[in-house]
Each structure stands twice: as C-alpha cells, then as structure tokens.
C-alpha cells in the first residue's frame, strides 16, 4: 500500500471577518492509525487549532464525523473569523506513539487571508476654535481593515481637498491595518454651515465608501463687527444709542455699555437673528438721559465674544447740541432690525 499523503487542496482561502473559514484536508489512507491535528504556523512556535484526540475548541467544527473509523476527511470550519486568525494552517497526521503520538506527515498548508472592513472613520478637528483666513488641521482615523490597500479622500462641502497627508500602519505584514490622515483647511467667514468629510474606500465595502464628518461650526469663530449709532426719541432730554453686533459665531456673547468708562449695563445675547450663512446678529439699545449730564458723554459698546478679548466701539454724545439734531441718519438703518430690545 502506498504511504499516506496529507492533501490540502487549497493554497489560500479568503474570508470576510465574521464569517466561517473552511480549511480542507484529506488523507489518502487510514494507516498508520493516529489522529489529525491542525496548526497555525510551522515550527516549534506553532499554535494548535484543533486536536482530534482531545481538548476543547469551541470555534472549530469538523466537516465530517471524525469518530467514524473509515473517515479520511479532516477538513475543519473555524467560525467568527477575525483578522487575528490570518496565517498559514497545516493539517498534520500523527501516528500513535508512546508516551506521545508522533508527527507522521503534514499537508502543504493553506494560507487564510481575512478581509476585514475598516471601522467608521472618525474625524476630529482642532481643540480650539479658529477665525477665518486661518488654516486648521483635521484628522481622520479608521482601524481594523485588511488587506492593506485602502483609499482615503477629503472633501469640504463636496469639493475634494488636496492638502492632506495619509499614513497606513503598520508598514510591514500585519493581521489588520489602520489609516491616519491629516488635512489642512483654510477657514472662510461663510464656513459656519460647512462640513469636512473623510471618505474611505476599501475592497470589503463593495464600492460603498465609509464617511466621517466634522462640522466646521465646531471649529470656526467669526468675530463680530460693531456699529454704534444714535437715534432721537420723542422725549427731548433722551437719546437712544444702539450697538449693532453683526455676523458673529458662535452665539456666546456678552455686551457691556460704558458711560465715560463706567459700566452702565451688562447683558448676554439671547434673542438673536440668524443670517443665511449661519452667523448671528444682535442689537442692544441704551437710553441716555441727556439732562443728567453737564458735559459731553463718551458711550462705549464693549463686546466679549466666545471668551475672546473684548472689542469695543465708542460714540461721543454731545450734550450741548439738541438731541434731535444728532445721528439723523441712524433711524433708517434700524428699521430693518428684527429685534427691538429697548431698555
């Protein structure tokens, strides 16, 4: 009778993560009697995957009934495959020996490759907000994919970005890989509603790439522009001074009125109007009793926006002049305001 041969017909097997791998092995003879064992890798450090004789291998099932005496099919199935299962698997026939069974013949090996999907890309922006015209960096990370080949693209509002650097780690062979990319984005005043998108394409995704997004509203700070104007009111001894705070983002804003450098009133922006570009407008009024002042009054609107150093705009109120003669151009400007916070 010809000497037993161990046949592993598949040189390689490709399996998607989470699926079951079938590793085929047959023997050409029943003799010499002895068990089959499956190993991952070769040499002294090889890992036992299945032992026909003893042990508990919860993820492994045999294709045929190995307790049948006439069985020569030693194929196994390994369930719930992960990238860590990748490697070369050997079906090894032992003959019975004492005290231990003796390795008799090995199959040629089957290389198990695992296709694993990348994790959903996570996009993160800078820790602190930045103002328009500044360049900010966004990072995109995705992990656990195999094989190594992967494509990553960056978009801002649908427009592909070109200023980015991407690394796939590790450089050498591994069971799975990670991708890390950093893109540079120049902020504009119109970016409150903008999105930065990181798109990852991989063979496991069947042409349906994964996307991670970051809203520039989390990153941008648009500082306000201030305008202080004076309007007459019916009462002859009163003047209405308005401070228009325009085109700011985010909404967090505190306004302080100063009369000749002394704090008159402080308020926090609450009822604001939103512009189409996502920025906000707000208006504050100060009613000044002119008769209470003998000298000219310097009115200052001081705004602290989003924890930044305060910006201010001043207006000189001439007490000597008649109130109605001052700021005659301002009433028309205010008619378009949605908010009338009159104090």
């Amino acid at each position: 009778e010809e000497e037993l041969q161990v046949i592993q017909p598949d040189k390689s097997v490709l399996v998607a993560a989470g699926e079951t791998a079938t590793l085929r092995c047959t023997a050409t003879s029943l003799i010499p009697v002895g068990p089959i064992q499956w190993f991952r890798g070769a040499g002294p450090g090889r890992e036992l995957i299945y032992n026909q004789k003893e042990g508990h291998f919860p993820r492994v099932t045999t294709v045929s009934e190995l307790t049948k005496r006439e069985n020569m099919d030693f194929s196994i199935r390994i369930g719930n495959i992960t990238p860590a299962d990748a490697g070369t698997y050997y079906c090894v026939k032992f003959r019975k020996g004492s005290p231990d069974d003796v390795e008799f013949k090995s199959g040629a090996g089957t290389e198990l490759s695992v296709r694993a999907k990348p994790s959903a890309p996570v996009v993160s922006g800078p820790a602190a907000r930045a103002t328009p015209q500044h360049t900010v960096s966004f990072t995109c990370e995705s992990h656990g994919f195999s094989p190594r080949d992967i494509t990553l693209k960056w978009f801002k509002n649908g427009n592909e970005l070109s200023d980015f650097q991407t690394n796939v780690d590790p450089v050498g062979e591994s069971v799975s890989y990670s991708i890390h990319s950093t893109a540079k984005v120049v902020l504009t005043r119109e970016d409150v509603h903008s999105q930065v998108i990181c798109e990852v394409a991989h063979v496991t995704l069947q042409g349906d790439p994964l996307r991670g997004t970051a809203n520039l509203s989390e990153t941008i700070r648009v500082p306000p522009t201030l305008e202080v104007t004076q309007q007459p009111v019916r009462a002859e001894n009163q003047v209405n001074v308005t401070c228009q705070v325009r085109k700011f983002y985010p909404q967090r804003l505190q306004l302080t009125w100063l009369e000749n450098g002394n704090v008159s009133r402080t308020e926090t922006a609450s009822t604001v109007t939103e512009n189409k570009d996502g920025t906000y407008n707000w208006m504050s009024w100060l009613l000044v009793n002119v008769s209470a002042h003998r000298d000219d009054v310097k009115l200052t609107c001081q705004v602290e926006h989003d924890g930044q150093p305060a910006v201010s705009k001043s207006h000189d109120l001439k007490v000597s002049a008649h109130p109605k003669e001052q700021g005659s151009n301002t009433a028309a400007e205010n008619t378009g305001s949605n908010e009338r916070n009159i104090y």
């Epitope: 029943l30 010499p32 002895g34 020996g97």
Partner: antibody, heavy 120, light 107 residues
Framework: QVQLVQSGAEVKKPGASVKVSCKAS????????ISWVRQAPGQGLEWMGW????????NYAQKLQGRVTMTTDTSTSTAYMELRSLRSDDTAVYYC?????????????WGRGTLVTVSS | DIQMTQSPSSVSASVGDRVTITCRAS??????LAWYQQKPGKAPKLLIY???NLQSGVPSRFSGSGSGTDFTLTISSLQPEDFATYYC?????????FGGGTKVEIK
C-alpha cells in the same frame, strides 16, 4: 483474510518465562498498533500493554512493568509478548488485538487467544 | 488510572426485551469508549466504538450513547445469540482499562 493467528497453549512452571506470538495477515501490519489483553479463568479483561507496529514504541501496564516485553517483526508481520518470572496468578488466556482507533484505542480484530497455565 | 465501573454486573432478560447496560468512567474520557461482547471460550468482539459508532457487521439493535463520564449500551430487542458478557473499555489514554463486565443471562 484479515486475521491474527496466535501460537499454541503453554504450560509453565513458576519463575519461568513465556513468549507468545501473534501473526497478522490480510492487512498492512505497520499501520496499526497491537495490544495484549489477558483474561484469568472466570475473570474480566485486563490490558497488559501496547506496541506500535510502525515505530516500535511501547506502553506497559504498571503492574507488569519490568516483567513484560513486547516486540514486533515487521518482516514477518508478527508481534510477540514475553512475560518473565511467571507466577500462578499469571494463568490466563492471552489475547493479541489490533488497535484500530485513529484518536483513541479500541480493538477491532482479536486473536483466538493463547492459554498459558502456570503450575508447579 | 481511569477506573471503569459497569452496572449491573448481571441481568436476566427474555428474548425481545430491551436491555440497558451502563458504564461510568472515574474521569472524563470524551467519546473514547468501546463496547465488546464476549461469549464463553471466544475472544471479545467489538460492537461499538467512539461511544456511539456501530462497528461494521454488528446488528443495528445494538446502540451506544454518552460522553464524558457516563455511557450506555442498549440492546433494543434481545435475540438468543445476544446472551453473553459485555465489557466497556476506555480508549482515551494509557493505561487502557476495562469495566468489570455485565453478564446477560436468560430469564
């Protein structure tokens, strides 16, 4: 025809030795192990030991260690069991059996048995 | 060593009866258990191997079950030629050990 043919009955005196043969035919002798099992009159089965017909490795029952030797001759497809320093309680029928399990030990083919009587 | 305890040691039954013999191992032996039938003056004959596999040529009225430590041999309908002594044997590891035997006698 697949069979194991054993040598004939033996009568031995205490302290003597006996060598029982077991000739295999009809199958590849080197592919299987051979175990020796004995049965004293009116008693159950007692495993004595095992030999690989392929590599010659052996494993003996503790109580017989030092008194028993099992060998094979692959050229004649014959297994031998020698038991030394015989005692009266060694009186038994001695069977050779082919061990056929792949991951386990069981015996699918038996010789007819050799009666060994130890008596002064 | 692994001890094999067989019960009962003897059973009286009639032709057509269902007979059950049990065997308990002193430690787990997976499915590596065999059952043999022996008639007076004859060598044992293998009936069941690996706990539940019927040896080629053995009638299907014989069946085996069990795993770990507890095993059963069942003769579904006893025939005249089945009156004999039955032995279990563990084949998991050396030293190989046999149960004490169960004698099936005619009632």
């Amino acid at each position: 025809q697949v069979q194991l043919v054993q040598s004939g009955a033996e009568v031995k005196k205490p302290g003597a030795s006996v060598k029982v043969s077991c000739k295999a035919s009809g199958y590849t002798f080197g592919g299987y192990g051979i175990s020796w099992v004995r049965q004293a009159p009116g008693q159950g089965l007692e495993w004595m030991g095992w030999i690989s017909a392929y590599g010659g490795e052996t494993n003996y029952a503790q109580k017989l260690q030092g008194r028993v030797t099992m060998t094979t001759d692959t050229s004649t497809s014959t297994a031998y069991m020698e038991l030394r320093s015989l005692r009266s309680d060694d009186t038994a029928v001695y069977y050779c059996a082919r061990e056929a399990g792949s991951s386990w030990y069981d015996f699918d083919l038996w010789g007819r048995g050799t009666l060994v009587t130890v008596s002064s | 060593d692994i001890q094999m305890t067989q019960s009962p040691s003897s059973v009286s039954a009639s032709v057509g009866d269902r007979v059950t013999i049990t065997c308990r191992a002193s430690q787990g032996i997976s499915s590596w258990l065999a059952w043999y039938q022996q008639k007076p003056g004859k060598a044992p004959k293998l009936l069941i191997y690996a706990a539940s596999n019927l040896q080629s040529g053995v009638p299907s009225r014989f069946s085996g079950s069990g795993s770990g430590t507890d095993f059963t041999l069942t003769i579904s309908s006893l025939q005249p030629e089945d009156f004999a002594t039955y032995y279990c044997q563990q084949g998991a590891s050396f030293p190989i050990t046999f149960g004490g035997g169960t004698k099936v006698e005619i009632k």
